[in-house]
């Protein structure tokens, strides 16, 4: 014998009050898949939350964060403040990038400048808080005589802090 | 799989204590520090405190020191929040989180898995 609740599609559930009779959810309230005995209620988006996308019958409200923060956690279940370049969040707080490092983002870590001299570089351009340095041509590339064409080095992730 | 449980929050009256305990499953309990977090309705996440895999070493941030204990029972796979004299400012939603290496401390979030949150009302 099929169960007559299996008939109720998604928006609806089946009321067994009302002899199983499907009935629409409630507002603020949704189901997003057949036969269902009971509607969830629809996630609110309030505070440091904002709705990005309305609740309907059929699927819930989806929420992001308020500008000065960023989602955490699946389907955004948080919002973690935002810092400003050249910071990083620790667990008291935005703090400026230790020397010898840099933030470029408003969010994520500190990181190492590139160390220059592991591919035989020289610093062209000073790193600060908020950009890494940038490596220039090696001396060798500077003596009279060499070719004026080097081949690039290969990219590599931001090394040690320059002895 | 690895997950997080949160569990014991509820309404309680200004002044009063609630636990907080969060399960754990799917990775090696004792190996990781465990962090509390919180999520206060207006604002963002808030470090509350964090306990090294052996819980020898324990760190608390200054808005919760001396109210709140946190501790673990690596046998029973478990993480503990002990909060007395509650104030309004402590309602909020509470996250455990697993961290990324067995120490941990102070500064760097070192999070890889969040619980899905209990919430703790404080009511005057």
């Known amino acids: 014998l099929q169960d007559p609740c299996s008939n109720c599609p998604a928006g609806t559930f089946c009321d067994n009050n009302r002899n199983q009779i499907c009935s629409p959810c409630p507002p603020n309230s949704f189901s997003s898949a057949g036969g269902q005995r009971t509607c969830d209620i629809c996630r609110q988006c309030k505070g440091v939350f904002r709705t990005r996308k309305e609740c309907s019958s059929t699927s819930n409200a989806e929420c992001d964060c308020t500008p000065g923060f960023h989602c955490l956690g699946a389907g955004c279940s948080m919002c973690e403040q935002d810092c400003k370049q050249g910071q990083e969040l620790t667990k008291k707080g935005c703090k400026d990038c230790c020397f010898g490092t840099f933030n470029d983002q408003k969010r994520g870590i500190c990181r190492p400048w590139t160390n220059c001299s592991l591919d035989g570089k020289s610093v062209l351009v000073n790193g600060t808080k908020e950009r890494d340095v940038v490596c220039g041509p090696s001396p060798a590339d500077l003596s009279p005589g060499a070719s004026s064409v080097t081949p690039p080095a290969p990219a590599r992730e931001p090394g040690h802090s320059p002895q | 799989e690895v997950q997080l449980l949160e569990s014991g929050g509820g309404l309680v009256q200004l002044g009063g204590s609630l636990r907080l305990s969060c399960a754990a499953s799917?990775?090696?309990?004792?190996?990781?520090?465990m962090t509390w977090v919180r999520q206060a309705p207006e604002k963002g996440l808030e470090w509350v405190s964090s306990?090294?895999?052996?819980?020898?070493?324990?760190y608390y941030a200054d808005s919760v020191k001396g109210r709140f204990t946190i501790s673990r029972d690596n046998s029973k796979n478990t993480l503990y929040l002990q909060m007395n004299s509650l104030r309004a400012e402590d309602t909020a939603v509470y996250y455990c989180?697993?961290?990324?290496?067995?120490?941990?401390?102070?500064?760097?979030?070192?999070?890889?898995?969040w619980g899905q949150g209990t919430t703790v009302t404080v009511s005057s």
């Open positions: 989180a697993k961290e990324r290496t067995g120490t941990t401390g102070d500064y760097y979030y070192n999070v890889d898995v």
């Open positions: 799917g990775f090696t309990f004792s190996s990781y520090a």
């Open positions: 306990i090294s895999g052996s819980g020898g070493n324990t």
